[in-house]
Amino acid sequence: TLNSVLNSNAIKNLPPPLGGAAGHPGSAVSAAPGILYPGGNKYQTIDNYQPYPCAEDEECGTDEYCASPTRGGDAGVQICLACRKRRKRCMRHAMCCPGNYCKNGICVSSDQNHFRGEIEETITESFGNDHSTLDGYSRRTTLSSKMYHTKGQEGSVCLRSSDCASGLCCARHFWSKICKPVLKEGQVCTKHRRKGSHGLEIFQRCYCGEGLSCRIQKDHHQASNSSRLHTCQRH
């Protein structure tokens, strides 16, 4: 269980005083049962550990992904785990470290030479064998072979937000993902009522920009739950 992570939960790196920024302590681990170490395949207990809970990958760092730390773990307990290096097992692109992507359950390099064909195949595979289309658009999506070598501009195909230029995030568009603008004040945003609901969106929105949060528009408070409009608002 997750709790075995915390059997020895002392923090050796004492936090700084109020307002100070802490360093990023390493993912040092010591042996013990029950926990899948984020970067590999061995069961270990994590010591000196500060679990950072999350609901989706965007809440974690660029070198992390969001998942349950135990196999078959409680969906209500998800934390940021270290990304998986090349040749490690994966279930989605975000699990693989930047410069890699998930192909056939393994993190592989997204280097320029073989990236284009493989990622095209992977995106098609990701959505199963149903080859139907929506509004005449094909599910097969080709990525530029220059990806990962320059930051994607708006509309560029991406795997994760770190592939996109500043002010953009990587969001689903049909059955691929492209760089879209981070939402500004007053723009409509999506408030996910339950974990994982964002996975159903064909046209996914970015999150609200810094200093903003996705909240119900004041004049929509009386509306029914299903019709409530959320917008990015300042605190």
Epitope: P15, P53, E59, G61, E64, G76, R194, H235
Partner: nanobody
Framework: EVQLVESGGGLVQAGGSLRLSCAAS????????MGWFRQAPGKEREFVAA????????VYADSVKGRFAISRDNAKSTVYLQMNSLKPEDTAVYYC??????????????????WGQGTQVTVSS
């Protein structure tokens, strides 16, 4: 820069309850995870509980699971720690911590970068 102020600590008898609060200011509260840590005299600081930015994921230390509950109110920029069935071994200074917001703020790793000054909790037997 984030500022965190804890309150709600005090002296309570074993078996009693306390509710700690941590008010945050200085950045969009709803963008980052929040955690509670504690440090008993002569011991190292240890993790107690944490909650994701959307409140959909919570995690607890073994020693407090089933007794403590973490929650947050994003509208009030406040995180809470409800502590029930308190034991003498829960005596410590309790610290509130705010995460760095992860990749949304350009970080390679999501970590607790901001800390409050702490509030004393004493449980007498």
């Amino acid at each position: 820069e984030v500022q965190l102020v804890e309150s709600g600590g005090g002296l309570v008898q074993a078996g009693g309850s306390l509710r700690l609060s941590c008010a945050a200011s200085g950045r969009t509260f709803s963008s980052y995870a929040m955690g509670w840590f504690r440090q008993a005299p002569g011991k190292e600081r240890e993790f107690v509980a944490a909650i994701s930015s959307s409140a959909s994921s919570t995690v607890y230390a073994d020693s407090v699971k089933g007794r403590f509950a973490i929650s947050r109110d994003n509208a009030k920029s406040t995180v809470y720690l409800q502590m029930n069935s308190l034991k003498p071994e829960d005596t410590a200074v309790y610290y509130c911590a705010a995460g760095n917001g992860g990749r949304k703020y350009g970080h390679h790793r999501a970590r607790y970068d901001y800390w409050g000054q702490g509030t004393q909790v004493t449980v007498s037997s």
